[in-house]
Interface confidence: low
């Protein structure tokens, strides 16, 4: 015998519900109809749905799914977005401080060099900023350019101040002599090594965060397939066709549907886990010469030492350069005059006292800890979405896609699905092209992160020892050493805890500026999730 008509024999409830989805009632039957044209909500008897309603339900179901996915990723998305912005700004602040300290060192110790030195220092740190943000600049070239530019000024201002104006066309010769005679000793090489290591790591760290944003944005804006739309419609809306307005889908059924719909997205899981673990490894290695905060904020000291090195060898150098660059001068001219204060005592720059011990490195570790709580994000998505959409508790008295059942049975539900579309097939289709692309990008960044994961055998420290620098003086639990030669290493107590300015740009520049750029991103975020402590580096 035919099944009884739906409890709502006039389709009144269905009409009023559908009115909210689609103003106008022309698609809703007044009373139950055979529904022979339906393709998704296949009726077992009279139905309150039409083909047009079914299409609208499918569209709504897919939109619902997209919104659920977006809300699922909202917290993670803002965690990475906020931190990417904060770190980018923080790195710029480190660069600005490093520039200010270097300028201050020149101002305090070598005032006669300042006009030109400020300019060269500004250019150097601009390049540093651009490099961090992905610009194709060679770090060795940056360092060479800094020392090539500084040496003629040091020579003409400090070493041979009696040089007549007519001899000032020797700049090119002096730039060449700087490298040939190694006038700054091994300091340029030391700076190259430290700066390139620390900036490389910083750059890849920012790249990784920006890729994290891209991954979330990609999965956030996935368009679900028609098959998925049909499955979702059956789960969420087909019960309405039978007038069952209050019934909820079975939890187990929801999980099956979500796993089908999210099969492609879940494929990201393996690479996402690897991404977070590789990022953690990178962050764990970001200390000493792999920490740009440590390296850049110590540059003023190393540059100061390098100029002292030149001054100590000034007599010998002046003679050699006088011969080497004689052809550039109208007559060979050397002054025996040296300013009395040539061998200036080192003045350790006063570092502004900041009470809290917060650093970028602790902020990085905090981010990793938070990211690790999202390590199963993609594999847990189907379950998360089911738990955040209406499902029946305990799988009792619930909708299984075809009918109201006392208890959900996965086997029965699957058998019922087979005659409409194959769930297994849906899983086998493989990820969307955009998902495949993002997986490729994750593979690439994971490879980069792995190759960049630092201190395996402290190779670099060994190299520095060979160059004659006493890196042995710096134990891990001592104050960090910042650059320096064997006879006068500057130590800055506790490094510089300047995070007070992290992302809160309170400029103290009094030297010529260096313009810095931010990496453009197309995405606009218009909903700001309250991140609580994520925004506050001081808790």
């Amino acid at each position: 015998q035919p099944p009884p008509p739906p409890p709502d024999a006039t389709c009144h409830q269905v009409r009023s519900f559908f009115q909210r989805l689609q103003p106008g009632l022309k698609w809703v039957p007044e009373t139950p109809v055979p529904g022979s044209d339906l393709q998704v909500c296949l009726p077992k008897g009279p139905t309150c749905c039409s083909r047009k309603m079914e299409e609208k339900y499918q569209l709504t179901a897919r939109l619902n799914m997209e919104q659920l996915l977006q809300s699922a990723s909202m917290e993670l998305k803002f965690l990475i977005i906020q931190n990417a912005a904060v770190f980018q700004e923080a790195f710029e602040i480190v660069v600005r401080h490093a520039k200010n300290y270097t300028n201050a060192m020149f101002k305090n110790n070598y005032p006669s060099l300042t006009p030109q030195a400020f300019e060269f220092v500004g250019e150097f740190f601009t390049d540093v900023s651009l490099y961090i943000l992905g610009s194709d600049i060679n770090v060795d070239d940056m360092v060479n350019e800094l020392f090539d530019s500084l040496f003629p000024v040091i020579y003409t201002q400090l070493m041979n101040p009696g040089l007549p104006d007519s001899a000032l066309d020797i700049n090119e010769c002096l730039r060449g002599a700087r490298r040939d005679l190694k006038v700054f000793g091994n300091f340029p090489k030391l700076i190259m090594t430290q700066v390139s290591k620390s900036l490389q790591v910083t750059r890849i760290f920012l790249q990784a965060l920006n890729l994290g944003i891209e991954v979330i944005n990609t999965t956030d804006h996935l368009k679900f397939s028609k098959d998925c739309g049909r499955m979702l419609t059956r789960m969420w809306y087909c019960s309405y066709c039978q007038g069952l307005m209050m019934v909820k889908p079975c939890g187990g059924y929801c999980n099956v549907v979500m796993q089908g719909c999210m099969a492609g997205v879940v494929e990201i899981d393996k690479y996402w886990r690897e991404y977070i673990l590789s990022l953690e490894e990178l962050v764990n290695g970001m200390y000493r010469i792999y920490d740009m905060e440590n390296v850049l904020l110590g540059l003023f000291s190393t540059i100061h030492d390098s100029i002292q090195y030149v001054q100590k060898n000034a007599g010998k150098l002046t003679t050699t350069i006088g011969k080497l660059c004689a052809h550039s001068q109208q007559r060979q001219y050397r002054s025996a005059y040296y300013p009395e204060d040539l061998f200036i005592d080192k003045k350790v720059l006063k570092v502004a006292h900041v009470e809290h011990e917060e650093t970028l490195s602790s902020r990085r570790r905090e981010l990793i800890q938070k990211l690790k709580s999202f390590i199963s994000f993609y594999s847990a998505l189907p379950g998360y979405i089911c738990s955040h959409s209406p499902v029946a508790e305990n799988d009792t008295l619930c909708w299984n896609g075809q009918e109201l059942v006392e208890r959900y049975s996965q086997k029965a539900a699957r058998n019922g699905m087979k005659n409409q579309f194959n769930l297994h097939e849906l899983k086998m289709k493989g990820p969307e092209p955009v998902v495949s692309q993002i997986i490729d990008k994750l593979k690439h960044i994971n490879q980069l992160l792995r190759t960049m994961s630092m201190p395996k055998g402290r190779v670099l420290d060994k190299n520095l020892d060979e160059e004659g620098f006493e890196s042995g003086d710096c134990g891990d639990d001592e104050d960090e050493c910042i650059g320096g030669s064997g006879d006068g290493m500057i130590k800055v107590k506790n490094q510089l805890r300047f995070l007070a300015e992290l992302a809160y740009d309170l400029d103290v520049d009094d030297a010529p500026g260096n313009s810095q750029q931010a990496t453009p991103k197309d995405n606009e975020i218009s909903t700001f999730h309250n991140l609580g402590n994520v925004h506050s580096p001081l808790k």
């Epitope: 809160y504 740009d505 750029q517």
Partner: antibody, heavy 116, light 107 residues
Framework: QVQLQQPGAELVKPGASVKMSCKAS????????MHWVKQTPGQGLEWIGA????????SYNQKFKGKATLTADKSSSTAYMQLSSLTSEDSAVYYC?????????WGQGTLVTVSA | DIVMTQSHKFMSTSVGDRVSITCKAS??????VAWYQQKPGQSPKLLIY???TRHTGVPDRFTGSGSGTDFTLTISNVQSEDLADYFC?????????FGSGTKLEIK
């Protein structure tokens, strides 16, 4: 030096929209957040939201969602805030301010008067 | 949202005196608090942040202290030009919020 220039006043009719500007100079516009703050005698200072011009990311105070829209034009180093469906409640001084937390630099403010 | 409460709407003081303006946060904001001064017809000016660091150019008679939920701005040796509104602000979490302000009046 850092400067944020805002027009002095805007008179608008109820129900209309207004788009106010904040022209930045003296620093790299794309490197810093630009925040917007509303001040009324009754409500005091209220944070509306912020935009990071470098990548266009915006964040809003829930209270001003749908009311305010923040944009930035990198080429002219100008940040904009559009207020829609204006009512007398929107009459206030609106400031742009630069920074990530404390605001070290503020514009002079734009007085918006909503009146028929 | 975090509510910043400045319990005194007005405070009266004399030139040369010392005055303390207080601000209470509805939840722990660490040390992410700033103080601003605003004179009639002008935009606010940053005085103190984190919450004891003086901004460039701010006279050293202005000092800030506190952490967690209780914060204080102290002006020692008050000058007539200090007559203004003073606001606290938290930047620990979005949305950033301000206190309602304390108007400093000179007797």
């Amino acid at each position: 030096q850092v400067q944020l220039q805002q027009p002095g006043a805007e008179l608008v009719k109820p129900g209309a929209s207004v788009k106010m500007s904040c022209k930045a100079s003296g620093y790299t516009f794309t490197s810093y957040n630009m925040h917007w703050v509303k001040q009324t005698p009754g409500q005091g200072l209220e944070w509306i939201g912020a935009i990071y011009p470098g990548n266009g990311y915006t964040s809003y105070n829930q209270k001003f969602k749908g009311k305010a829209t923040l944009t930035a034009d990198k080429s002219s180093s100008t940040a904009y805030m559009q207020l829609s469906s204006l009512t007398s409640e929107d009459s206030a001084v609106y400031y742009c301010a630069r920074g990530g937390g404390p605001f070290a630099y503020w514009g002079q403010g734009t007085l918006v008067t909503v009146s028929a | 949202d975090i509510v910043m409460t400045q319990s005194h709407k007005f405070m009266s003081t004399s030139v040369g005196d010392r005055v303390s303006i207080t601000c209470k946060a509805s939840q722990d904001v660490g040390t992410a608090v700033a103080w601003y001064q605003q004179k009639p017809g002008q935009s606010p000016k940053l005085l103190i942040y984190w919450p004891s660091t003086r901004h460039t150019g701010v006279p050293d008679r202005f000092t800030g202290s506190g952490s967690g939920t209780d914060f204080t701005l102290t002006i020692s040796n008050v000058q007539s030009e200090d007559l203004a509104d003073y606001f606290c602000q938290q930047y620990s979490s979005y949305p950033f919020t301000f206190g309602s302000g304390t108007k400093l009046e000179i007797k």
